[in-house]
């Protein structure tokens, strides 16, 4: 396994709908035609999965239907959106990439980007 | 509005090294590409190298590669040019650059792609 250094925005705070949207960018070494990437959500010392797509080069990423996650690349950069957040899913969201064909294998994880969620305000009851 | 001030330069022999510094003002300034350009007397601009936002992937000019090294530091809001073994071919106005949009993956070499523009430094080559 040999380490890649990858770099992500520092802050990024959440639309009112629960939308954020990061960059995620790596130093490829080499040409790679296969990637994964995969989004961390670190909180309280706890890491999860928050979403994962593989993506050959030039392709969209592929996310599975049930994914709160989209996103789309180009060239050594993906861009990532992550969809249904709430104040709670506030936290520390890692990117981490693979470089999987051709060999060999590289692996790089970024300082992550803290995205924070504020949930709207209920509206106040109308007569209108 | 972002200002680039750009320091360092100086005379120096060939063969010698210089470092060009870039100093930002502002706080989008890890969100950008930047670049260094330089423009010899009676010439036009040319590109001479580019970092991305994240300091992750750098270019360079053919002219330059092995010689320069491109580096950024976001905390510090400074861009930088490692000049070593230097030629008289080198002396001119270096100017750094700030691209045009933010988190863009455009890698771009071309003038029209950087938004922002310092006054520049000489750099000259002589013995």
């Known amino acids: 396994c040999k380490a890649m250094h990858v770099a992500q925005p520092a802050v990024v705070l959440a639309s009112s709908r629960g939308i954020a949207s990061f960059v995620c960018e790596y130093a490829s070494p080499g040409k790679a035609t296969e990637v994964r990437v995969t989004v961390l959500r670190q909180a309280d010392s706890q890491v999860t999965e928050v979403c994962a797509a593989t993506y050959m080069m030039g392709n969209e990423l592929t996310f599975l239907d049930d994914s709160i996650c989209t996103g789309t690349s180009s060239g050594n950069q993906v861009n990532l959106t992550i969809q249904g957040l709430r104040a709670m899913d506030t936290g520390l969201y890692i990117c981490k990439v693979e470089l999987m064909y051709p060999p060999p294998y590289y692996l790089g994880i970024g300082n992550g980007t803290q995205i924070y969620v504020i949930d709207p305000e209920p509206c106040p009851d109308s007569d209108f | 509005e972002v200002q680039l001030v750009e320091s360092g330069g100086g005379l120096v022999q060939p063969g010698g090294s210089l470092r060009l510094s870039c100093a930002a003002s502002?706080?989008?300034?890890?969100?950008?590409?930047m670049g260094w350009f330089r423009q010899a007397p009676g010439k036009e601009r040319e590109f001479v190298a580019a970092?991305?936002?994240?300091?992750?992937?750098?270019y360079y000019a053919d002219s330059v590669k092995g010689r320069f090294t491109i580096s950024r530091d976001n905390a510090k809001n400074t861009l930088y040019l490692q000049m070593n073994s230097l030629r008289a071919e080198d002396t001119a106005v270096y100017y750094c650059?700030?691209?045009?949009?933010?988190?863009?993956?455009?890698?771009?070499?071309?003038?029209?792609?950087?938004?922002?523009w310092g006054q520049g430094t000489l750099v000259t080559v002589s013995s």
């Open positions: 970092i991305s936002w994240g300091g992750v992937n750098t």
């Open positions: 502002g706080r989008t300034f890890s969100s950008y590409d």
């Open positions: 650059a700030r691209g045009s949009a933010p988190y863009s993956s455009s890698r771009s070499s071309a003038q029209e792609t950087y938004a922002q």
